[in-house]
Amino acid sequence: PEPPTACREKQYLINSQCCSLCQPGQKLVSDCTEFTETECLPCGESEFLDTWNRETHCHQHKYCDPNLGLRVQQKGTSETDTICTCEEGWHCTSEACESCVLHRSCSPGFGVKQIATGVSDTICEPCPVGFFSNVSSAFEKCHPWTSCETKDLVVQQAGTNKTDVVCGPQDRLRA
């Protein structure tokens, strides 16, 4: 018979034959042959593989480093990685939660809608027309543009979401 060019799901092609992949939680020890099945071994303590695979090494569980404010939210198994979270009152810097911050800041062009609490991070909002923020801050709201008119001045440079307007003297028409 012709050697296969493609294999079924949960199989892989090697040496012109289809071998079974190792199930999650196990790593490949040896490929199958004409006479033997794929040989797999369970991952060791603190290791995992989360897919049907032909990996010869299991992945190490993530370490939740207490020096970075991390603690274990969910202990890893042979099939799943450890999930880290931050100490109470601190917030993950990313979905992967590799480090912790007290709270995030709102970038220039954004103002703070809600200051962080122990359970929720800073909520930012874009500065609308007529308002600006030129700083990165965890507490400052968007500031309204300066009103040149109330100072008997005119707008020399328009404001943006990151900059205030620039006021200047009115042009005096000479008689």
Partner: nanobody, 116 residues
Framework: EVQLLESGGGLVEPGGSLRLSCAAS????????MWWVRQAPGKGLERVSA????????YYADSVKGRFTISRDDSKNTLYLQMNSLRAEDTAVYYC?????????RGQGTLVTVSS
């Protein structure tokens, strides 16, 4: 290396005052927004007060408004928290924090105990 060293805590009677300091080193202090946070025994972190990098804007938690004053001296690379009319519920370890407020940049804190 960023270092924040808090000091000025101690035991004080209700109604008394304390002034906390936070000496900063390892970064250009001027221009950085700074915060005071506190952690009471067995409780979570509470954000107490903040001051903008320019010193022109401040924030106070409702629980300390009118009693605490935050300030900074950029020439001394130091942040301050003047605490007046202290109450038992102000008892906590007080920490200062700088943007981006990473856990590994926090100081060791200074303990404030308000008790008669």
């Amino acid at each position: 290396e960023v270092q924040l060293l808090e000091s000025g805590g101690g035991l004080v009677e209700p109604g008394g005052s304390l002034r906390l300091s936070c000496a900063a080193s390892g970064f250009t202090f001027a221009g950085y927004e700074m915060w005071w946070v506190r952690q009471a025994p067995g409780k979570g972190l509470e954000r107490v007060s903040a001051i903008s990098g320019s010193g022109g804007s401040t924030y106070y938690a409702d629980s300390v408004k009118g009693r605490f004053t935050i300030s900074r001296d950029d020439s001394k690379n130091t942040l301050y928290l003047q605490m007046n009319s202290l109450r038992a519920e102000d008892t906590a370890v007080y920490y200062c924090a700088k943007e981006p407020y990473s856990f590994d940049h926090r100081g060791q804190g200074t303990l404030v105990t308000v008790s008669s």
